[in-house]
Structure formats: C-alpha cells, structure tokens
Interface confidence: medium
Amino acid sequence: GWVWNQFFVPEEMNTTSHHIGQLRSDLDNGNNSFQYKLLGAGAGSTFIIDERTGDIYAIQKLDREERSLYILRAQVIDIATGRAVEPESEFVIKVSDINDNEPKFLDEPYEAIVPEMSPEGTLVIQVTASDADDPSSGNNARLLYSLLQGQPYFSVEPTTGVIRISSKMDRELQDEYWVIIQAKDMIGQPGALSGTTSVLIKLSDVNDNKPIFKESLYRLTVSESAPTGTSIGTIMAYDNDIGENAEMDYSIEEDDSQTFDIITNHETQEGIVILKKKVDFEHQNHYGIRAKVKNHHVPEQLMKYHTEASTTFIKIQVEDVDEPPLFLLPYYVFEVFEETPQGSFVGVVSATDPDNRKSPIRYSITRSKVFNINDNGTITTSNSLDREISAWYNLSITATEKYNIEQISSIPLYVQVLNINDHAPEFSQYYETYVCENAGSGQVIQTISAVDRDESIEEHHFYFNLSVEDTNNSSFTIIDNQDNTAVILTNRTGFNLQEEPVFYISILIADNGIPSLTSTNTLTIHVCDCGDSGSTQTCQYQELVLSMGFKTE
C-alpha cells in the first residue's frame, strides 16, 4: 500500500524548490523499478515529484490566504510492466500559515453619537478588525485593540474592540472627538502586525445648561399713548445647549406683572415685553420689572442644572405725550332764569392740562350768540333769554391748550332756561259767537278756554272774570268752571238785531303765577234773527253765518 505522512508546505517560501515529503509504495524495494506520477491541480506547475523516489517538491511560492490546501492524485507504475503497482490515491498538501497579514478594519468609516455628560463606562461603539491569517495557527490572527488617540475621554476593551467613555465630556466645550484605534495581531507580541482606524464620535446635546440673560439690566421706553398689547422691546437670554434644549420661556416675577407681560418668540428665543395695561406718565413715569427665563423642556434627571432661574431687571421709562385738556366733568348742566340781563352769570367749567407742563387753558363755546365764556371758564349771557323761544341750549364747550392749539377737548354743555311768569294767559283761540234775538236769560252762548306760554311748576290755573264795565252793564255773565274753562251766558231775555247787532265783551283771564298776570280778551257776540225751529237765521254779517255753517235763504 501507499505510505506517506501529512504534507505541509509553508507559505511564502522564496526557494526555487522546497521538499515537502515523500510518497512511496511499500512494495518499492528501492531498486528504481517503480515510477511515481503526480496528477491534479498544481501538479507539474506548483508541485513536482521525483519519479524514482516519490519525493514531492514545491517549486512556486505559495500564499495560504489565496489557497490553503491542494488535493493531488498519486500513481505508482512498474516500469517493467507499465502497470499500476498501487491503486491511484488522493492526498492533500496543506499550506501552513505565517504571519504575513496585518489586521484590517472592514466597516470603516466609523461614526458614533453619544450623549454629552454620559457616565464612565458608557458604550460608544464596537470596532472590529479582521486578519486574513489562519486563526487556528498560533497567534497570527489573534488581535489586541488599543487606543492611539482619544485619552482620557475614551477607552477600548483590548479583546472586543468595544469603545467606552472613560471621562465625562461637555458638548459645549467640544462637540466631537476623533479616536484612533489600533489592532495588533500576535496578541501584541514582538513581530506583530497592526492596523488602525479612526472613529468620529459626536456628542449629542443634553439640557445641562440653563438659559442666562445677556444683560443684567435692560432699558426700555413706552409711550403713554401706546395701546395695550404694544410690544415695547425685546430681551434675550442665551443657552449653550442646542435644539429643543435651548428653547426657553420668559416670564415676569409675580409682583411685577400688573402693567407688563413677557411673551416668548419661540423662533428667535427672544422675550417680547408687552404692555398689559395702559400707562400714564403723570401717574407713574417709570417702572421696574424683574424677568426670569427657564428652559421649556427639562427632564427630571437634569433639574440639578436648573435650580435657579436667571433673572434680569428691566427698566421701563414712560414717555410723556402731550395730552389734550381734561374737563373736570364729562358734561355740564347749568340753569339760568329767562329775562336775566345781558352778562348774567350762568356757571363755571374747568379743564386742566393733564401733562406736567400744566399749560394754561383757553375756552370757547361753539356756535353760540347767546353765551360767552372767559379764560377762567366762566359762562355769562350775551343776550336776554326767553324760555318761551328756547327752553334748552345744547352747546359744546372747547378747551384748548394755550401753547399748543392742536390739543383740544370738547364736552357738551346743557343750559336750561328757567321760567319766570312773564306771560299772561290768553284765549286759546279767537272766539266769535252769536245770540238769538229771542234768547232767554241764562242761555249758554259760548264755552271759552285759555292758554299761558309760561311753564308752570304746578298745574296752570286760570281765573275768568268780566271787566268792570261789562260786569256793571252787561247783557251777559260768565261762570268760571274751575277747570281752566268758563261759560258765557245771557244775562237778559231778548236781543234786538237792529238796535244792537253785535256785543264786544271784555273778559279778564288771570293766572296763578307769582306775581299773577292778567290779560283782557275780547269776545265778539253777534245778534241773529233765529227762526222758531232754529233752522234759519239772519245776522248782520252773512260771512259769520256762512262761516258758522248756518243755512241762509
């Protein structure tokens, strides 16, 4: 049978031929009667055999990493007979490893993100190198990792390539680090080969910084004419963090939040100071408010960085605006008796300049020929007043600053003209009536009523009487009904159209004013010829008859 040992050939041998081993048949007695042959891939080119002895040689430099074993076939032939002495047999030549490959990092580039302020031991990333040498051949492919750059912040586990944090890092001081890792084979022993890789480690932000005001004092101004809601200025805090960790909220400390407010512009991260309540320079010309700023999002575990909110003082000066005069009252109502003489006192109005300058005020009454006003605000009559023409005056008073005539205020002025008893009562209409010739005594001729243009505090009460002459010598009499009316009655029987066609009766009407006023009013009575039926009459004046609607023949 065949006799051989396992065949090994070291890779990378530079000699022209390298003896690997011997193939032989146990029938071979060494007399050179056998011939050995090599068949298969590499036979003749990579490996040759001594046909007489069966010695195998490698005639080429081999690379295990390219091919680590060769499977060949061997034949042995009896030279004399040309027949195979042994059956053809397969055998293996293994290429043995030498440390001719350095470790290589195949997954480059390496990049990792880790939160800033992470504690020691936090895993960052694992790097892995590979070595093409034979892992089963000694230490040729056994690797050790070490840190060439990155101390003191990072460390690498020698056997796993796991990178860990070894010292806390602050993103606000440095936000990324380049770490260089070396992998050495031969577990670092002399003659080891090495490879390196770079790892970019970026620190992600955590909210470890509170916002801080850029200024300890801000100065702002607001006009006293500014409406509520006006933005009067901005304040700004800065936060070394980024993204949502730098989002902040501004507020006013409780005591100071009556007049102003602060809203946050979340795009610019500025605080906008807003006027919450109108200000008045003359009441308070400056304000001090204390503002504070806090982060919008602070996780519980990071509250230790945010114990005291940053504060700032805002000094707000109110700017004076020239304001129009201010009347003491929103409107004035005065009373004055009618018929008072020109120049009579009506009342006093008063306006003042609300500004600290206290400009003198000039007054005027718009569109009035009846009243005057002087620079003291005293109103007097410029004409006599007649309540029966106008009982109320609805006017407008204007106050103007002496040194700035554009500053004007106007308010309503109502003047009531009070009544005096300056009108006697009169007939409510013109009375003209008739009496029949055949009228009897006590016959009602006419009911009369009166009016008085004066205003009465109580109800008007009129008193009716005949004049003295008519009382003494009258064909008629009067009865006062006590209701501001009276009736005229005949005081005799029978009248004569031809002798006395018309009577003029003087009626006195007195009012109940103090003093009482009396007027004399004439009642005209025509004598008419009346038929028995009363359907036809003849009077002196046909017009009268027609106007009274009587039929005529």
Epitope: L217, R219, T221, D256, N285, H286, G288, F313, K315
Partner: antibody, heavy 119, light 107 residues
Framework: QVQLVESGGGVVQPGGSLRLSCAAS????????MDWVRQTPGKGLEWVAV????????YYADSVRGRFTISRDNSKNTLFLQMNSLRVEDTAVYYC????????????WGRGTLVTVSS | EIVLTQSPGTLSLSPGERATLSCRAS???????LAWYQQKPGQAPRLLIY???SRATGIPDRFSGSGSGTDFTLTISRLEPEDFAVYYC????????FGQGTKVEIK
Amino acid sequence: QVQLVESGGGVVQPGGSLRLSCAASGFSFSSYDMDWVRQTPGKGLEWVAVIWYDGSNKYYADSVRGRFTISRDNSKNTLFLQMNSLRVEDTAVYYCARETGEGWYFDLWGRGTLVTVSS
Amino acid sequence: EIVLTQSPGTLSLSPGERATLSCRASQSVSSSYLAWYQQKPGQAPRLLIYGASSRATGIPDRFSGSGSGTDFTLTISRLEPEDFAVYYCQQYGSSWTFGQGTKVEIK
C-alpha cells in the same frame, strides 16, 4: 478708587445760570445711568434729573423741567447739569449719584457742591 | 407722587441699644422698591438697604430692613458709635422720593 466728585457750585443771582460737573472714576461710567439729587434744609433730599447710560433719555423733576438740562460726556467720564433761570428755592447742595445696574436706587454718591441763589 | 413719612424725627439712644426707624408711604410702593441711606454731617448719603430688605455691599449685618406695601422699617440691632447719623428712606417704584429723615443721636 470708585468715586464721584462734583464741582461748579457757587453763588448766583436769581435768573442766573450755573453749570455743575461731576467727574467719575474707578468704574465703567458709560455703563451706568446717572442722576442729580439735591438737598435743601427745608425740603430734604430731592431727585432732580436722570440721564441714561448712553445719553439717549433724560428725565427731570417737575420743579426743574424746562430750566435744567442734564448731559454727559462718556469719553471724559463726566456728568453735567446746566442750570438756567435759577430761583431762590434752587439753593441746595447738589449731589451726583450713580444708579445701580439693576434698579433705580443710588449706590454711589459724590460729596456734593453747594449752589446758593441769592440777590 | 408718593410721599414718604419717617418717624420718629429724632431717636435718642445709647451705644449698644436697638434702633427701630419707620418709613410710611402715602400709597403702596410697588415691588418693595424701597431703599435706606445713612448720612453723616458733611458727607454724601450712603446706601444701606435696597429692595426693602437686601443689604448693600459692605454693610454690617446689624443693619436690617423689612416691610412691604406702605410700611417699612430699618432696624439697627446694636448701635455702634459710628451709627449715629441721619437715616433716609427712598422709594424708587414711582419716580424717586425721599423721606424727611430720622436723626439717631447719642443719648
């Protein structure tokens, strides 16, 4: 050291004028609002005027508005008070005072300069 | 304007005694914007207290301020010889006004 020194006081007739100066040293003058405060035996301490750190705003007490003018020269670290149309009641010791950075009280005062208005 | 009234006008005490000075405002002083000053003859006023109760830099802790709204107090716990002077309160919440002063004199 940190100090304020007033000068320019004196005796003046009613209707006359005076210009007071206040020299600042030892601190960043241009960062502070500055005031004038006067002291009379009758009325005690009375605030007169304030000027903001950069001169952009000036405010006066009612009693002096229109007659007094406050100004400053930050390049020379000096505060001024121009007093015109002086009245007898303006007689007082005039102090310049520094407002604090966070409020309106006065943390630094000068020694004062006496202004006497008399006929 | 806010009128500040100090009482008493004069306080006669001996060194080592406690001094209590009062300052009353005619209307509420916003956010306790009240300061106390000390003035010695021929000298400028010196800031003692601001914000009603905060001690100014370099002021000994025997000086303390309290109060809010309209009533404020300056207390000197143990009078030292150098504490005899005139004390003024000042409000700075609405313009600037001072009290008329309280003189602390040696008994």
